[in-house]
Interface confidence: low
C-alpha cells in the first residue's frame, strides 16, 4: 500500500502524525523501492543492466534530469527553484510512467503502484510549493503522441526505453530526496 494511503498509520493513534517533509521523504523511498523491483525484472529478462552507463548516457528520450541551474545541488542550492524543478520533472515523468504500464509481467502491480504513488507525491509537493505559477504542465497532445511512438517501437527498442526510464527516474528521485532533505 502506498504511503499516504497506509491503513496502519490510521490504526496507530499513539504514533506522532508524519510531518509534510516526513511524508514526502517516505513517499519517495516507497517509489524507489518499487523502481528497484521493476529494475530487477527488467535485468533478469536481458543483459541490458550490465551495459555501461556511458553506452546509455546519450539518448533522445528527453527524460527529466537535474542540472546545476535547477538549484537542487549543494552548490548553488535554491529552495524555490529546486522545488519547481522537482514538481515539473515529476509531471514530465508521468507520460513515461504510463508507458511502463503493461511492460511488466510479474511486476504489473508494482508498475501501477509506482505510477499512482508518484501522483500522490506530486500532490504533496504542490501543497508545499508557493510559486505554482512557475510550474509548467506538459502538453497532453504532445504526451499522447510521444506515448504512441514509444509503444510502436519493436521489442528491443521498448526494452531499451523501459531500462532508461527506470534508471533516469531512480536518479531523479534520489537527487530530489537529497535536495528535499535540505529544505
Amino acid at each position: 500500500v502506498p504511503p499516504g494511503e497506509d491503513s496502519k498509520d490510521v490504526a496507530a493513534p499513539h504514533r506522532q502524525p508524519l510531518t509534510s517533509s516526513e511524508r514526502i521523504d517516505k513517499q519517495i523511498r516507497y517509489i524507489l523501492d518499487g523502481i528497484s523491483a521493476l529494475r530487477k525484472e527488467t535485468c533478469n529478462k536481458s543483459n541490458m543492466c550490465e551495459s555501461s552507463k556511458e553506452a546509455l548516457a546519450e539518448n533522445n528520450l528527453n527524460l527529466p534530469k537535474m542540472a546545476e541551474k535547477d538549484g537542487c545541488f549543494q552548490s548553488g542550492f535554491n529552495e524555490e527553484t529546486c522545488l519547481v524543478k522537482i514538481i515539473t520533472g515529476l509531471l514530465e515523468f508521468e507520460v513515461y510512467l504510463e508507458y511502463l504500464q503493461n511492460r511488466f509481467e510479474s511486476s504489473e502491480e508494482q508498475a501501477r503502484a509506482v505510477q499512482m504513488s508518484t501522483k500522490v507525491l506530486i500532490q504533496f509537493l504542490q501543497k508545499k510549493a508557493k510559486n505554482l505559477d512557475a510550474i509548467t504542465t506538459p502538453d497532453p497532445t504532445t504526451n499522447a503522441s510521444l506515448l504512441t511512438k514509444l509503444q510502436a517501437q519493436n521489442q528491443w527498442l521498448q526494452d531499451m526505453t523501459t531500462h532508461l526510464i527506470l534508471r533516469s527516474f531512480k536518479e531523479f528521485l534520489q537527487s530530489s530526496l537529497r535536495a528535499l532533505r535540505q529544505m
Partner: antibody, heavy 122, light 109 residues
Framework: EVQLVESGPGLVKPSQTLSLTCTVS??????????WSWIRQPPGKGLEWMGV???????YYSPSLKSRTSISRDTSKNQFSLQLSSVTPEDTAVYYC??????????????WGKGTLVTVSS | QAGLTQPSALSVTLGQTAKITCQGG??????AHWYQQKPGQAPVLVIY???SRPSGIPERFSGSSSGGRATLTISGAQAEDEGDYYC???????????FGGGTHLTVLG
C-alpha cells in the same frame, strides 16, 4: 569514432547467393541497444532497407526481401554479414551497412559504410 | 509494406527556405529520420527522431512531424545543401525500416 567497411565480391552470377561482410571498428556490435542494418541503392535509384541484426542477435527483414535475405554476425571478429539468395540483375546495387545507435529512439542510422557496388551479371 | 511519399524534386533559391515533405506509412506512430546524400557518397543523417539534429549538422536544418506528415526544413539554403534527401521511418510493426523515394534538391543562384 565508429567505422564500418563493407567487403565482398563485386560481381555475382544470376541465381547465385550474394555474400557481403561489414567490419566494425571503434564500437562493439554487441553494445546494448545498437543495431546493424544493410541498405542498398540500385544505380540512379533510391535507398532500400534490407534488414537488421540487433545487439542481442535478433534479426528483422524487409517484408519484400524476407524470403531471400539472411543476416548473421561474428562477434569475435566484430562483423555482421548479409546473404541474398537467388540474385537477378535487379539486385545490382551499391550495398551499405549502417548502425542505429542507442541514442536514437527510432530506426535512424547515424554511421554508414562507404558502400560497395555489387553487379549481378553472367 | 506501405512506402513513404516524397516529392521527386524541389528547387530553392540560394538563401531561401526549402521544405521537403514526407507522408504515408506509419509516420503518425513512428519517428521520421532524414538523410542527405551527395553523388558517390553514403547518406548522412541530418535529422533523427522527428526533430533532433545530430552534432555537426548546421542549425539551418530542422525537422517536424504532425498527423502522419514529416517535414525537413532548410532555412537559408546554401549551395552545399544541393543533393538527394531521403526520409525514413519504421513500418507499422516497428520491426522494419522503410525509406521514402528521395527528393533531389537544387539550389539556384
Amino acid at each position: 569514432e565508429v567505422q564500418l567497411v563493407e567487403s565482398g565480391p563485386g560481381l555475382v552470377k544470376p541465381s547465385q547467393t550474394l555474400s557481403l561482410t561489414c567490419t566494425v571498428s571503434g564500437g562493439s556490435i554487441t553494445a546494448s541497444f545498437d543495431a546493424w542494418s544493410w541498405i542498398r541503392q540500385p544505380p540512379g535509384k533510391g535507398l532500400e532497407w534490407m534488414g537488421v541484426i540487433a545487439y542481442d542477435g535478433s534479426t528483422y527483414y524487409s517484408p519484400s526481401l524476407k524470403s531471400r535475405t539472411s543476416i548473421s554476425r561474428d562477434t569475435s571478429k566484430n562483423q555482421f554479414s548479409l546473404q541474398l539468395s537467388s540474385v537477378t540483375p535487379e539486385d545490382t546495387a551499391v550495398y551499405y551497412c549502417a548502425r542505429k545507435s542507442s541514442w536514437l529512439i527510432g530506426y535512424g542510422m547515424d554511421y554508414w559504410g562507404k558502400g560497395t557496388l555489387v553487379t549481378v551479371s553472367s | 509494406q506501405a512506402g513513404l511519399t516524397q516529392p521527386s524534386a524541389l528547387s530553392v533559391t540560394l538563401g531561401q527556405t526549402a521544405k521537403i515533405t514526407c507522408q504515408g506509412g506509419s509516420l503518425g506512430s513512428s519517428y521520421a529520420h532524414w538523410y542527405q546524400q551527395k553523388p558517390g557518397q553514403a547518406p548522412v543523417l541530418v535529422i533523427y527522431d522527428d526533430d533532433s539534429r545530430p552534432s555537426g549538422i548546421p542549425e539551418r536544418f530542422s525537422g517536424s512531424s504532425s498527423g502522419g506528415r514529416a517535414t525537413l526544413t532548410i532555412s537559408g539554403a546554401q549551395a552545399e545543401d544541393e543533393g538527394d534527401y531521403y526520409c525514413q521511418s519504421a513500418d507499422s510493426s516497428g520491426n522494419a525500416a522503410v525509406f521514402g523515394g528521395g527528393t533531389h534538391l537544387t539550389v539556384l543562384g
